[in-house]
Interface confidence: low
């Protein structure tokens, strides 16, 4: 089915990174435009992105109302200036997306270190807790709202001086470690979740060494 | 490759009770409605039961009552627990797999992953 | 319930011919409508969903098409695997019901 001047949409994928959700496809439409629908697996379908030239949907907005639901869009090819005409069946056409679960396939951003402060030979390091934009009672939660336990940070440290890196694990958004007095170290993190199959990790975060202002130093 | 393998068929009295098990791999199992279809010897297909990724289950008039469907998402399994079991309910019970969407302009992609079959024989 | 009539009951027929089979619904089922293959001693097989839409792995000789109430599998040239019966399935009301089958021999 389908009219006879539209071309079906085709590599339909879903980019998303802290569930910030967009579904991109292709082609660049040539006299036609596009409409997108999106539906968990036992609701109705929700139409957005209404009569666009675009090759992307945000989605984000419906995604977020329940980030464990699997996700299945749709896009719709019709005739530019003409949304009513379709084909001989009396639909448009259409390509169905791949499913997408957001919780256990959004990207994880890159992580921030937020701040280290050194206490003698300890050094407390402190991962930012990027907010994202999934809300509960009209507030934004952060990352670790939404993952809880699920989501760990691994942090990779070593002193200036040399490239042997060491590591630590965390469940919250802070570490507790060692360090040889009168050292400089440099720190990176990365957040995890080990439960997942795919998508388990995200980048590296910038390289933090101490001496620079993130950091602070206390003399005990 | 994504594949359901079916156990706990066999023979049992009438009103006796008998539990069916599938086993699902290759895909990520919580993501997916799953069925039980019957099919009597020399007959067609029968739907059986239902239960969607959220745990609604949904059953066929002539066992309703009488057989429960349940999965464990943790074991990747599906179940069908069948009670008095009558001669009527003697078939080929398969297991089935789907991406279920209701709803307006709703679709869904149909039953694409099948068990192997168990047989449940009725008999005194 | 819905109910699904299938015709002919039985269609014989030689390869590489046309085989034309109908699934008839008692009310309209929209486009929510499945056609399935089943061999001896198998499990079912997924041909067609969404009434026109084929499987993966199915060959572009499976057609599907209609839609509301009358819907029709269309094999362009019968292959020796083809023998065998199918089904059609709708689901747009519980409870979820098949057709009797359409057995495809070989003539």
């Known amino acids: 089915s389908g009219t006879t001047n539209t071309v079906a949409a085709y590599n339909l994928t879903w980019k998303s990174t802290n569930f910030k959700t967009i579904l991109e496809w292709e082609p660049k439409p040539v006299n036609q435009v596009y409409t997108v629908q999106i539906s968990t697996k036992s609701g109705d379908w929700k139409s957005k992105c209404f009569y666009t030239t675009d090759t992307e949907c945000d989605l984000t907005d419906e995604i977020v109302k329940d980030v464990k639901q699997t996700y299945l869009a749709r896009v719709f090819s019709y005739p530019a200036g003409n949304v009513e005409s379709t084909g001989s069946a009396g639909e448009p056409l259409y390509e169905n997306s791949p499913e997408f679960t957001p919780y256990l396939e959004t990207n994880l951003g890159q992580p921030t270190i937020q701040s280290f402060e050194q206490v003698g030979t300890k050094v407390n390091v402190t991962v930012e807790d990027e907010r994202t934009l999934v809300r509960r009672n009209n507030t934004f939660l952060s990352l670790r709202d939404v993952f809880g336990k699920d989501l760990i940070y691994t942090l990779y440290y070593w002193k200036s001086s040399s490239s042997g890196k060491k590591t630590a694990k965390t469940n919250t958004n802070e570490f507790l470690i060692d360090v040889d007095k009168g050292e400089n170290y440099c720190f990176s993190v990365q957040a995890v979740i080990p439960s997942r199959t795919v998508n388990r990790k995200s980048t590296d975060s910038p390289v933090e060494c101490m001496g620079q202002e993130k950091g602070e130093f206390r003399e005990i | 490759e994504d594949q359901l393998v079916q156990s706990g068929g066999g023979l049992v009295h009438p009103e006796g009770s008998l539990r069916l098990s599938c086993a699902g791999s290759?895909?990520?199992?919580?993501?997916?409605?799953m069925n039980w279809v019957r099919q009597a010897p020399g007959k067609g297909l029968e739907w059986v039961s239902t239960v969607d990724t959220g745990g609604s289950t949904y059953y066929a008039d002539s066992v309703k009552g009488r057989f429960t469907i349940s999965r464990d998402n943790a074991k990747n399994s599906l179940y069908l627990q069948m009670n008095s079991l009558r001669a009527e309910d003697m078939a080929v019970y398969y297991c089935?797999?789907?991406?279920?969407?209701?709803?307006?302009?709703?679709?869904?992609?149909?039953?694409?992953?099948w068990g192997q079959g168990t047989t449940v024989t009725v008999s005194s | 319930e819905i109910v699904l009539t299938q015709s002919p009951a039985t269609l014989s027929l030689s390869p590489g011919e046309r085989a034309t089979l109908s699934c008839r619904a008692s009310?309209?089922?929209?486009?929510?409508l499945a056609w399935y293959q089943q061999k001896p001693g198998q499990a079912p097989r997924l041909l067609i969903f969404?009434?026109?839409n084929r499987a993966t792995g199915i060959p572009a000789r499976v057609r599907g098409s209609g839609s509301g109430t009358d819907f029709t599998l269309t094999i362009s040239s019968l292959e020796p695997e083809d023998f065998a019966v199918y089904y059609c399935q709708q689901r747009s009301n519980w409870p979820f019901t098949f057709g009797p089958g359409t057995k495809v021999d070989i003539k």
């Open positions: 969404d009434a026109s």
């Open positions: 290759g895909f990520t199992f919580s993501n997916y409605a």
């Open positions: 009310q309209s089922v929209s486009n929510y």
């Open positions: 089935a797999r789907d991406l279920l969407v209701r709803g307006a302009l709703g679709y869904y992609y149909g039953m694409d992953v």
